[in-house]
């Protein structure tokens, strides 16, 4: 029962996480104009992975796609790639995990197959979550670097009279969505891997059996032999399941509130 719950919860958490990764990837607010130094601007700029937008004080918003592939920074391309890989792996993981769910019966699928599928989807979720976290972190690092670079030459004076205020960008909402979503997908993946341990049939060690050869009183004790050796044992192969008991170390909990600077 606990295995089913762990697997189901892992699936739901991963589903939410992957939905979040997709949302973050599509969002326009990966970086938003820093208003600390220019709180009086009547034009607000923000950028996503696919387009940049400008919102005027009237509420009119204008977005322009990045209609170039080669002209974009390598880091932005890398972030795009990481997010897409995360989504693809997550989507495949979801597909696999649906069939692996213990509560869903598909034909005569053995529990060992379900265990393998659960483990596969779990690993996929973990890699998917890591891809998202990595992608968001790379972008955040890029923002921090650019922020301090633009701060260094914030005002480029022209004869001391004319000032050109450089637009600085800070963390947008998509970064926080991405981090949380990546974390959830990762947690979901770990839960699936834990559930897999409970689903996997353990190998049965058979007790020593005495074989009496006619006319001899010698007892053979094939202690190390498994059922697969076929030594005429009457013992039936029994699939032994872990009842789902978990040590405290294995209990998964949601992350507490994070303070982002």
């Amino acid at each position: 029962m606990a295995v089913t719950a762990c697997q189901g919860l892992g699936f739901v958490v991963s589903l939410i996480g992957i939905a979040g990764i997709i949302a973050a990837t599509c969002m326009d607010q990966w970086s938003t104009q820093d208003l600390y130094n220019n709180p009086v601007t009547a034009v607000f700029n923000y950028q996503g992975l696919w387009r940049s937008c400008v919102r005027e004080s009237s509420g009119f918003t204008e977005c322009r796609g990045y209609f170039t592939l080669l002209g974009l920074p390598a880091m932005l391309q890398a972030v795009r790639a990481l997010m897409i890989v995360g989504i693809v792996l997550g989507a495949i993981g979801l597909l696999v995990s649906i069939f692996a769910l213990k509560c869903i019966r598909i034909g005569s699928m053995e529990d060992s197959a379900k265990a393998n599928m659960t483990l596969t989807s779990g690993i996929m979720f973990i890699v998917s979550g890591l891809c998202a976290i990595a992608g968001v972190s790379v972008f955040a690092n890029m923002l921090v670097t650019n922020f301090w670079m633009s701060t260094a030459n914030m005002y480029t004076g022209m004869g001391g009279m004319v000032q050109t205020v450089q637009t600085r960008y800070t963390f947008g909402a998509a970064l926080f969505v991405g981090w949380v979503a990546g974390g959830l997908t990762l947690i979901g993946g770990v839960m699936m891997c834990i559930a897999c341990r409970g689903l996997a049939p353990e190998e049965t060690n058979y007790k020593a059996v005495s074989y009496h050869a006619s006319g001899h009183s010698v007892a053979y004790k094939p202690g190390g032999f498994k059922a697969s050796t076929g030594f005429g044992s009457n013992t039936k192969n029994k699939k032994i399941y872990d009842g789902g008991a978990r040590t405290e170390d294995e209990v998964q909990s949601y992350p507490s509130k994070h303070d982002y600077v």
């Epitope: 104009q33 950028q47 400008v54 009237s58 205020v165 637009t167």
Partner: antibody, heavy 120, light 113 residues
């Protein structure tokens, strides 16, 4: 047709307050921000502030902060500009002007103006 | 605050001739996000409210004759009237639409020579 009709001329004593109204018609009132601009006799234009009738959000010129209050009444599609602690330098024509939606923050329609005279 | 400086203060041009008014801002009005300039030009005739002529530094407002044109980028802008007509006699103002408080130039009075 978009129209902004302002209230009539006012004569006030120093230290008093004045409330000028601007009635909008010919468009969806809550969809456009309304700015207030003043012009002293023979002088240039000076921006006072704006109000967003949709959520009553306001932004004021620091020069007028604490003395000016912008309000709106959705039921009558009217915006109001109240200026307190009047001084002789506040003698000017006060205009309400609608912020265009796609005009790069420029004001596309203006009221006819309200002359406020501050004199003892 | 962004300071807008217009030149000249007054201008006398013959009918049919070209009139040019300049406007300089103390900070760039070019927005990096969309590469648009946030500057407007207004015309004000005696006893009337200002009328929007040009926005975004170069886009003519609907209904404005095509003899009016705007140009420039960053901090330097120009309003040009290609062929002056009698009804163009007015005071012209440039306005910063990029940052609050919105600021106007001191105005340029255009007269017929």
């Amino acid at each position: 047709e978009v129209q902004l009709v302002q209230s009539g001329a006012e004569v006030k004593k120093p230290g008093a307050s004045v409330k000028v109204s601007c009635k909008a018609s010919g468009y969806t009132f809550t969809s456009y921000i309304m700015h207030w601009v003043r012009q002293a006799p023979g002088q240039g234009l000076e921006w006072i502030g704006y109000i967003n009738p949709y959520n009553d959000g306001t932004k004021y010129n620091e020069k007028f902060k604490g003395r000016v209050t912008l309000t709106s009444d959705k039921s009558t599609s009217t915006v109001y500009m109240e200026l307190s602690s009047l001084r002789s330098e506040d003698t000017a024509v006060y205009y309400c002007a609608r912020l265009g939606f796609t005009t790069r923050n420029a004001m596309d329609y203006w009221g006819q103006g309200t002359l406020v005279t501050v004199s003892s | 605050d962004i300071v807008m400086t217009q030149s000249p203060d007054s201008l006398a041009v013959s009918l049919g001739e070209r009139a040019t008014i300049n406007c300089k801002s103390s900070q760039s009005l070019l927005n990096s996000g969309n590469q648009k300039n946030y500057l407007a030009w207004y015309q004000q005739k005696p006893g009337q409210p200002p009328k929007l002529l040009i926005y975004g530094a170069s886009t003519r407002e609907s209904g404005v004759p095509d003899r009016f044109s705007g140009s420039g980028s960053g901090t330097d802008f120009t309003l040009t009237i290609s062929s002056l007509q009698a009804e163009d006699v007015a005071v012209y103002y440039c306005q910063n639409d990029h940052s609050y408080p919105f600021t106007f130039g001191q105005g340029t009075k255009l007269e017929i020579k």
